[in-house]
């Protein structure tokens, strides 16, 4: 299953990046898991992952740094909290779990890039 | 004549972006031209351009966006001032203009990201 | 519904060699990534090596380079994994699983397993000392 991402994003000075993950979906899934994975250093991590109801919000975990909104077989991601140390390949992951048959797609990639923020002056 | 440069570059905070421009020289130049191209939006702009004598600094014009040194075949370039939307691509060309033959070099380009800060809170 | 089959696993000295075989069905080998991983009880799963291209392309894990050997037959749609000179430290469940081409020498990399989908059951090779 094809699965489409930008790839190129900067995260804003405040360490937000978001970016569109869609897919190309062969049925009529009902229920869709969406995971953000992340790959640097020779290493691939689990940013966070989702679950939903075709037409429901995405509900992340309380503790998560993802957010998202679904429209179709569009996901709009947003990932907060990240600094320059955070850069590195963000891929996305899609998995049709309901009705059968299962279907995965994984996309390319968005590398994010991040630079930290000058801190601003004391104010004295 | 073949010319290396990184293919991407993180702009700091405050807007300063620095990479290495290196050339494979042909020949024993003694005097050598470069020039900082910015590519984008269907668009090539001049940013900067200098004229050095190998072994000497790089003197780029008063008013000049650019600093640079030069360590035999690498030349250290540093564009400062940079907002949001300068990110392009900055392409290095390298000129030998002096002693015969003229041998010139463009590299593939250096896409430079520039995120702007977020303003400092006022100090009341 | 793509699935994949795994067999050939079993229980040998060390020193001693296993060919494991992963069947694919409703999914072309050929033209994806082919990956054989193993998980040891407690320990995340670890890619031991890859295949991609129709066999042209392949990838190992630094512990098992020169001993295990991943190969494709096209015909059968199915991937091997020759194991040669075992150790006991190769004793695990051993999967296949197929992934993006894009991504296939990503499997090696710690956490390289997310990238992979479509598991089959597992077979397990056990090696004693």
């Known amino acids: 299953m094809h699965v489409a991402q930008p790839a190129v994003v900067l995260a804003s000075s405040r360490g937000i990046a978001s970016f569109v993950c869609e897919y190309a979906s062969p049925g009529k899934a009902t229920e869709v898991r969406v995971t953000v994975l992340r790959q640097a250093d020779s290493q691939v991590t689990e940013v966070c992952a989702a679950t939903y109801m075709m037409g429901n919000e995405l509900t992340f975990l309380d503790d998560s740094i993802c957010t998202g909104t679904s429209s179709g077989n569009q996901v709009n991601l947003t990932i907060q909290g990240l600094r320059a140390m955070d850069t590195g390949l963000y891929i996305c992951k899609v998995e049709l779990m309901y009705p059968p048959p299962y279907y995965l797609g994984i996309g390319n990639g968005t590398q994010i890039y991040v630079i930290d923020p000058e801190p601003c002056p004391d104010s004295d | 004549m073949h010319v290396a440069q990184p293919a991407v570059v993180l702009a700091s905070s405050r807007g300063i972006a620095s990479f290495v421009c290196e050339y494979a020289s042909p020949g024993k130049a003694t005097e050598v031209r470069v020039t900082v191209l910015r590519q984008a939006d269907s668009q090539v702009t001049e940013v900067c351009a200098a004229t050095y004598m190998m072994g000497n600094e790089l003197t780029f014009l008063d008013d000049s966006i650019c600093t640079g040194t030069s360590s035999g075949n690498q030349v250290n370039l540093t564009i400062q001032g940079l907002r949001a939307m300068d990110t392009g691509l900055y392409i290095c060309k390298v000129e030998l203009m002096y002693p015969p033959p003229y041998y010139l070099g463009i590299g593939n380009g250096t896409q430079i990201y520039v995120i702007d800060p977020e303003p400092c809170p006022d100090s009341d | 519904q793509v699935q994949l089959q795994e067999s050939g696993g079993g229980s040998v000295q060390a020193g001693g060699s296993l060919r494991l075989s992963c069947a694919a069905s409703r999914y072309t080998a050929s033209s994806n990534c082919m990956a054989w991983f193993r998980q040891a009880p407690g320990k995340e799963r670890e890619g031991v090596a890859t295949?991609?291209?129709?066999?042209?392309?392949?990838a190992y894990a630094d512990s098992v380079k020169g001993r295990f050997t991943i190969s494709q037959d096209n015909a059968k749609n199915t991937v091997y994994l020759q194991m040669n000179s075992l150790k006991p430290e190769d004793t695990a469940m051993y999967y296949c699983?197929?992934?993006?081409?894009?991504?296939?020498?990503?499997?090696?990399?710690?956490?390289?397993?997310?990238?992979?989908?479509?598991w089959g059951q597992g077979t397990q090779v056990t090696v004693s000392s």
């Open positions: 699983g197929a992934g993006s081409p894009r991504f296939c020498a990503s499997a090696t990399m710690t956490g390289g397993h997310h990238l992979f989908g479509y």
């Open positions: 295949i991609y291209n129709g066999g042209g392309s392949t």
